[in-house]
């Protein structure tokens, strides 16, 4: 039975040209995290494998930095980066947990972080 929950940074916004940290946290389970995939609307950005380390997809390697932790840092943001991001936790023996983050990249200098929220 899957008992864990994913806590994410929720809905966030950032300025064009700036950077943002995408962060998820898996709690309430003793399952072993084997891999975390970071995806943007069905496109794989990066994989953090417990044994193999980070694999950043080539088209993002110049502006995606691994970490902190299992999170992902997006740099040199453009308005095209606006959209949904998913952290997919592969765990053993529980299976897969998915968290969702919505990022809005703003032209203006006003960018505020949304509240944290949980997905069971």
């Amino acid at each position: 039975m899957m008992t864990g929950t994913i806590e994410t940074t929720g809905n966030i916004s950032a300025e064009k040209g700036g950077s943002i940290i995408l962060q998820c946290h898996l709690s309430s389970t003793t399952a072993q995290v084997t891999q975390v995939n970071w995806e943007q609307q069905d496109q794989l950005l990066a994989i953090c494998n417990a044994d193999l380390g980070w694999h950043i997809s080539p088209s993002f390697k110049d502006r995606v930095a691994p970490g902190p932790g299992l999170g992902l840092t997006l740099q040199s943001l453009t308005v095209n980066d606006t959209g949904e991001y998913f952290c997919i936790y592969h765990t053993y023996p529980d299976g897969t947990y998915t968290g969702r983050i919505f990022l809005e990249v703003l032209e203006s200098s006003v960018a505020e972080h949304g509240a944290r929220f949980q997905i069971p």
Epitope: D51, P58, S59, P93
Partner: antibody, heavy 119, light 106 residues
Framework: QVQLVQSGAEVKKPGSSVKVSCKAS????????INWVRQAPGQGLEWMGR????????KYAQKFQGRVTITTDTSTNTAYMELSSLRSEDTAVYYC????????????WGQGTLVTVSS | EIVLTQSPDFQSVTPKEKVTITCRAS??????LHWYQQKPDQSPKLLIK???QSISGVPSRFSGSGSGTDFTLTISSLEAEDAATYFC????????FGQGTKLEIK
Amino acid sequence: QVQLVQSGAEVKKPGSSVKVSCKASGFNIKDTYINWVRQAPGQGLEWMGRIDPASGDTKYAQKFQGRVTITTDTSTNTAYMELSSLRSEDTAVYYCPKSGDYGWYFDVWGQGTLVTVSS
Amino acid sequence: EIVLTQSPDFQSVTPKEKVTITCRASQSISSNLHWYQQKPDQSPKLLIKYASQSISGVPSRFSGSGSGTDFTLTISSLEAEDAATYFCQQSNSWLTFGQGTKLEIK
């Protein structure tokens, strides 16, 4: 086109070391990850380790830890694998595949380098 | 270490026949399973990634399925050029390969 060209066959004495090179063309190795996989005669495939040429970060299979060193020279777009303390069981074809764009699978392989360890 | 066990080890088949090769993992690996074809004296060639995702340039007769611990590579209608050894590989943990399945054409 995208390809990996490896150095030629080697014959080595037990206890010595071998260094195999893998030159990339058609892509920049800093944009991907280079792995080394070996195959003993008539046997299966065995992953040895990988390098992120952009950062120099390496990961090695436990079996080869302390005996294998993977490096790159990004100025020549070349990866290297050095295996030390050679024994007869290291006789194999050594391949340098690059990781696929979306994970730890191998989409382009070098032609292989036969390393023979014999006294 | 995750162990991958392929079956059969060897299969002799006739052209146009449907061929199924299985790969079983010693623990769940989600869909982190990839398939390769290796012909004699050649480097392996990627056929399928992530259990079922097709690869550009690979004939459509090759398909993959499965998740968790049980995976299948299917060749819908065998051709003479498909004589080769087929390997599965997992990327859920330290990278490991199956022992291989040799396909012979009758």
